[in-house]
Interface confidence: medium
């Protein structure tokens, strides 16, 4: 168990050209405040899932009034640290959404509003009990400065908090196989713990990492109860006299999914799936407009009649949920024949054929494509009673034998020019764009390329938000 | 329901004055944030002067066509908000409307000024 | 002064259409901005403030949509006591100022 600490430096325009106004208006004063979110590993994760490490809100800002006609200048910053406790091992390494949201003040009706001015991500390896590490993250032509680490909360210790400090029991030295506790040399190193993760209630563990279960419990973590088909009286703990297991209290119990979410058990805890116009672990945060970005994944929001459908997602192909929060899974259906490969790329599904198969779902039996031959590299493929040949890059026709313009087909994005070269092409970039084919903006503006915004906070305690 | 009703309008001569009320019924009125528009052919809406509630000490704001010229000012004990409007000139010429809260929520009928040479 | 421009100055349309009015600022006016509708009497009512937010007792049939210079208000369902000149406003920087206006009409 532990805490990772969060310190805002400053929040700003950043250097060079294009620096922003004021995020206040000149009509409304308004203030900042900042959302951090948390979630293991190194994945890329998408920014509506759920920060599995823990959320932390901050408190408001001072209030700060817009000077007419005066750049930006770095703004007003709430007080203190923002905290996220984490109940288990801290994992080294861990992906983070730090956002900055405004608070507008004023007469307005309906009490303040608040809009997402920017979000930084990022993905960094760090050891618990470390140093202060620094960073700066760009969000369009904002600026964020700030400061982070992770520390144990005793008595765990280590790098991952998960070896335990105990006051020595014998004042000259430590028991058999345990080595004093730097930097506490007054203690003792308590013997590792169970697997990280492993339920207190139903766990336990006789060697270090391993978590073994209590009856009626299963799973790698001890968190699935363990149900028998010829069991069949209700949720309650084991009957001595049927000797029947029954599963102990679920976490969807009671539904802890509030204002009609749907609730799943997950490996760890629960899920709550949230009708439109709420979100929030337990859909607790309400009263979603389309100025709130509420729609992921490139969603159109589009405004609603009342407030209990205030927008609705048009989600693009791949996605689904109230927000378009949710990959569809398309594989999932094995859409592919003939032990094809299925890959959803988003826009549209694939099939990778194995050889001897063709088709978009690689229904076509094709014929041989023995003595066939391919010029300079190319690969031959079977189809309907004839062969094909796959040419490599800067080669075409049916037997690869031809010179070809690999800049025909118009392969850099973003208005690149395309170069003919003789191991195939280059692409010069547009200014603002990078990568082999120019498909990646350098600096991503923070209203829309970075990954949307969650729907738009309410009144109320922050606690509420996380 | 909300009532903003604008009056003082009329006929005024080049580089005399004229002081347009407004009275205001159906909302917290010493909330809100009152302001002046007006209305003409050549130059559409135009924004005239702002008047900020007593937490935001009564500030007033004016675009530079006007400042000088003009002053807003509110009683908030009778719900009423006024422009006081000094050396008018031909371009001052429109319909003025009252209207309430920072998003301009709240419009009246508006008060015809008309300023002859 | 930011400048605002309604580009369509007049827009017919039939009942029961999809009618979409369309505002630039000058420069960014970070979502500071309303949609307003005024009557051929002269009333003026508000419909859309902060881009996207309907005020209250406004049909679910106007919306608004934008970001940044570029603003549009839609009416998904033409009736018509939706005849009347549509205006922008932006209030992000003073001197708070209108577009032109767009006057609807029914074909």
């Known amino acids: 168990a532990g805490v990772f600490e969060l310190q805002i430096h400053s929040f700003g325009p950043g250097p060079g050209p294009g620096a922003p106004r004021s995020p206040c208006s000149a009509r409304l004063p308004c203030r900042l405040f900042f959302r951090v979110c948390l979630k293991p590993g190194l994945s890329e994760e998408a920014a509506e899932s759920p920060c599995a490490l823990g959320a932390a809100l901050s408190a408001r800002g001072p209030v700060y009034t817009e000077q007419p006609g005066a750049p930006a200048p770095d703004l007003p910053l709430p007080d203190g640290l923002l905290q996220v406790p984490f109940r288990d091992a801290w994992p080294g390494t861990f992906s983070f959404i730090i956002e900055t949201w405004r608070e507008e003040l004023g007469d307005q009706i309906g009490g303040p509003a608040w809009s997402l001015l920017a979000r930084v991500a990022g993905r960094r390896r760090l050891a618990a009990g470390g140093p202060w590490a620094r960073d700066i993250q760009r969000a369009g032509a904002w600026e964020l400065r700030f400061s982070y680490r992770a520390r144990c909360e005793p008595p765990a210790v280590g790098t991952a908090c998960t070896r335990l400090c105990r006051p020595r029991s014998a004042p000259s030295r430590c028991g058999p196989g345990l080595r004093p506790c730097a930097p506490l040399e007054d203690e003792c190193e308590a013997p590792l713990v169970c697997r990280a993760g492993c339920s207190p209630e139903h766990g336990f563990c006789e060697q270090p990492g391993e978590c073994r279960c209590l009856e009626g419990w299963t799973g790698p973590l001890c968190t699935v109860p363990v149900s028998t088909s010829s069991c069949l009286s209700p949720r309650g703990p084991s009957s001595a006299t049927t000797g029947c297991l029954v599963p102990g209290p679920g976490p969807c119990d009671g539904n802890p999914c509030a204002n009609g979410g749907s609730c799943s058990e997950t490996p760890r805890s629960f899920e709550c799936t949230c009708p439109r116009g709420f979100y929030g672990l337990r859909c607790e945060v309400s009263g979603v407009t389309c100025a709130d970005g509420p729609c992921f994944n490139g969603g159109l929001c589009v405004g609603g009649a009342d407030p209990d459908s205030a927008y609705i997602c048009h989600c693009p192909p791949g996605f689904q949920g109230s927000n378009c929060e949710k990959r569809v899974d398309r594989c999932s259906l094995q859409p592919c024949r003939n032990g094809g490969l299925c890959l959803d790329l988003g826009h549209a599904l694939r099939c990778r054929c194995r050889a001897g198969f063709a088709g978009p779902r690689c229904e076509h039996d094709l014929d041989d494509c023995a003595g066939r031959a391919c010029a300079n590299g190319g690969t031959c493929v079977e189809g309907g009673g004839a062969h094909r040949c796959s040419c490599a890059l800067g080669f075409g026709g049916r037997d690869c034998r031809e010179r070809a313009d690999p800049c025909a087909a118009r392969p850099c994005a973003h208005g690149g020019r395309c170069y003919a070269h003789f191991s195939g092409l280059v692409c010069a970039c547009a200014p603002g764009y990078m990568g082999a084919r120019c498909e990646f903006p350098v600096h991503p503006d923070g209203a829309s390329a970075l990954p949307a915004a969650p729907p738009g906070l309410r009144p109320g305690d922050p606690q509420r938000y996380l | 329901e909300v009532k903003l009703e604008e009056s003082g309008g009329g006929l005024v001569q080049f580089g005399g004055s004229m002081k347009l009320s407004c009275a205001a019924s159906?909302?917290?009125?010493?909330?809100?944030?009152m302001d002046w528009v007006r209305q003409s052919p050549e130059k559409g809406l135009e924004w005239v002067a702002e008047i900020r509630n007593k937490a935001n000490n009564h500030a007033t704001y004016y675009p530079e066509s006007v400042k000088g010229r003009f002053t807003i000012s509110r009683d908030d004990s009778k719900s009423r908000v006024y422009l006081q409007m000094n050396n008018l000139r031909a371009e001052d010429t429109g319909i003025y409307y009252c209207?309430?809260?920072?998003?301009?929520?709240?419009w009246g009928q508006g008060t015809l000024v008309t300023v002859s040479a | 002064d930011i400048q605002m421009t309604q580009t369509t100055s007049s827009l017919s349309a039939s009942l029961g259409d999809r009618v979409t009015i369309s505002c630039r600022a000058s420069q960014d006016v970070i979502n500071y901005l309303n949609w307003y509708q005024q009557k051929p009497d002269g009333t003026v009512k508000l419909l859309i403030y902060y881009t996207s937010r309907l005020h209250s007792g406004v049909p679910s049939r106007f919306s608004g949509s934008g970001s940044r210079t570029d603003y549009s208000l839609t009416i998904s369902n033409l009736e018509p006591e939706d005849i009347a000149t549509y205006y922008c406003?932006?209030?992000?920087?003073?001197?708070?100022?209108f577009g032109g206006g767009t006057k609807l009409e029914i074909k």
């Open positions: 406003q932006q209030y992000s920087e003073r001197p708070y100022t």
């Open positions: 159906g909302f917290t009125f010493s909330d809100a944030w």
């Open positions: 209207t309430g809260y920072s998003s301009f929520a709240y």
